[in-house]
């Protein structure tokens, strides 16, 4: 799948939601930041991206599998068993609902209202029976309980 | 498509400084992070800077801190390198690359522009 | 800083035969929470800028030829040219994106 294919608007979830949490010690560090004078914090900024951008890409996979002509390289890789693995071996858990209902619930409307839109529709379309078996399997392991608990953890209402 | 084209570079003398700037189109600049790397004939490829989408974080190779600065106008879609008290190690083609959805993954680079430090 | 070393630093193989490249990791770039490899390859044909080939080790970016494919985990990698076309002739690279990204030696592919 291509990298290139999806723009990230409203400056999402991978772009926006990496940034190191705004305390007071944080600050210091965020001036430290803009002078250049820490190098190590970019492998801590680089290890705070890590889960995101996997959420990240499998949000663009979805929103990238109802373009028809963008479909290629994601059914060669699923025919691969490939793509399913991916999910699976991060995704082991619970049912979408509980993410969604996390989401929609407001803890993260106000930061993420264009993926907030997404699961919803999701969870719509799954609701109503229209998403293929492979999307269903996606979405029921979308909500891990470790990555709901990282979010959590990271008090992403905080972040910048 | 995308494109990104730098602009910039030529001889410079050892301690003195150049600008370097980078022109996006075709994609949406202002959502993604950006990187300079630079591409030296003994030292190979060298991660030079990077600056988050909207210029709140920014972080540099050990080699370049404290004299290079990263910085980008999102209203005019133009990543910049400020580089000062350059020496010969800086010598290298230096490309500005978009970063993918996946951090320090670069999807796409620039046809690069030449900095020559020499007396 | 993860050190990438790439073996060998150049190699030629007639066309239509397979070339491989080796590239090692001074550490582990496997991230376990989503036994996802941060490894990438790059293509870079004569005054050209580095191309994005292969990113997680094994996936194939968008419009990259099937004949190329990425295997390995933990610390060493493999790229696979399966059958060589004249137009591979290039320097390849692997990246590491785990940290600090850092780059290969490059390995120049020619034919034979």
């Known amino acids: 799948r291509s990298l290139q294919d999806t723009e990230e608007k409203s400056r999402s979830f991978s772009a926006s939601q990496a940034d190191p949490l705004s305390d007071p010690d944080q600050m210091n560090e965020d001036k430290r930041h803009s002078q250049g004078t820490f190098t190590s914090d970019y492998s801590k900024y680089l290890d705070s991206r890590r889960a995101q951008d996997f959420v990240q890409w499998l949000m663009n996979t979805k929103r990238n599998r109802n373009n028809i002509a963008k479909r290629h390289d994601e059914f060669e890789r699923h025919a691969e068993g490939t793509f399913t693995s991916d999910v699976s071996s991060y995704l082991e858990g619970q049912a979408a609902k509980e993410f969604i209902a996390w989401l929609v619930k407001g803890r993260g409307r106000r930061d993420f209202p264009e993926e907030v839109a997404i699961v919803e529709e999701l969870g719509r379309r799954h609701a109503d029976g229209s998403f293929s078996d492979e999307m269903n399997t996606i979405l029921d392991n979308l909500a891990a309980r470790d990555f709901i608990n990282w979010l959590i953890q990271t008090k992403i209402t905080d972040r910048k | 498509q995308v494109q990104l084209v730098e602009s910039g570079g030529g001889v410079v003398q050892p301690g003195r400084s150049l600008r370097l700037s980078c022109a996006a189109s075709g994609f949406t600049f202002s959502s993604y992070g950006m990187h300079w790397v630079r591409q030296a004939p003994v030292k190979g490829l060298e991660w030079v800077a990077f600056?988050?989408?909207?210029?709140?974080?920014?972080y540099y190779a050990d080699s370049v801190k404290g004299r290079f600065t990263i910085s980008r106008d999102n209203s005019k879609n133009t990543l910049y390198l400020q580089m000062n008290s350059l020496t010969a190690e800086d010598t290298a083609v230096y490309y500005c690359?978009?970063?993918?959805?996946?951090?320090?993954?670069?999807?796409?680079w620039g046809q690069g522009t030449l900095v020559t430090v020499s007396s | 800083d993860i050190v990438m070393t790439q073996s060998p630093d150049s190699l030629a193989v007639s066309l239509g035969e397979r070339a491989t490249i080796n590239c090692k990791s001074s550490q582990s770039v496997l991230y376990s929470s989503n036994n996802k490899n941060y490894l990438a390859w790059y293509q870079q044909k004569p005054r050209q800028p580095p191309k994005l080939l292969i990113y997680?080790?094994?996936i194939r970016e968008s419009g990259v030829p099937d004949r190329f494919s990425g295997s390995g985990s933990g610390t060493d990698f493999i790229l696979t040219i399966s059958s060589l076309q004249a137009e591979d002739v290039a320097v390849y690279y692997c990246q590491q994106f785990y940290s600090i990204p850092t780059f290969g030696q490059g390995t120049k592919l020619e034919i034979k």
């Open positions: 997680w080790a094994s």
């Open positions: 690359a978009k970063e993918s959805i996946l951090a320090a993954l670069f999807d796409y």
């Open positions: 600056i988050s989408y909207d210029g709140s974080n920014k």
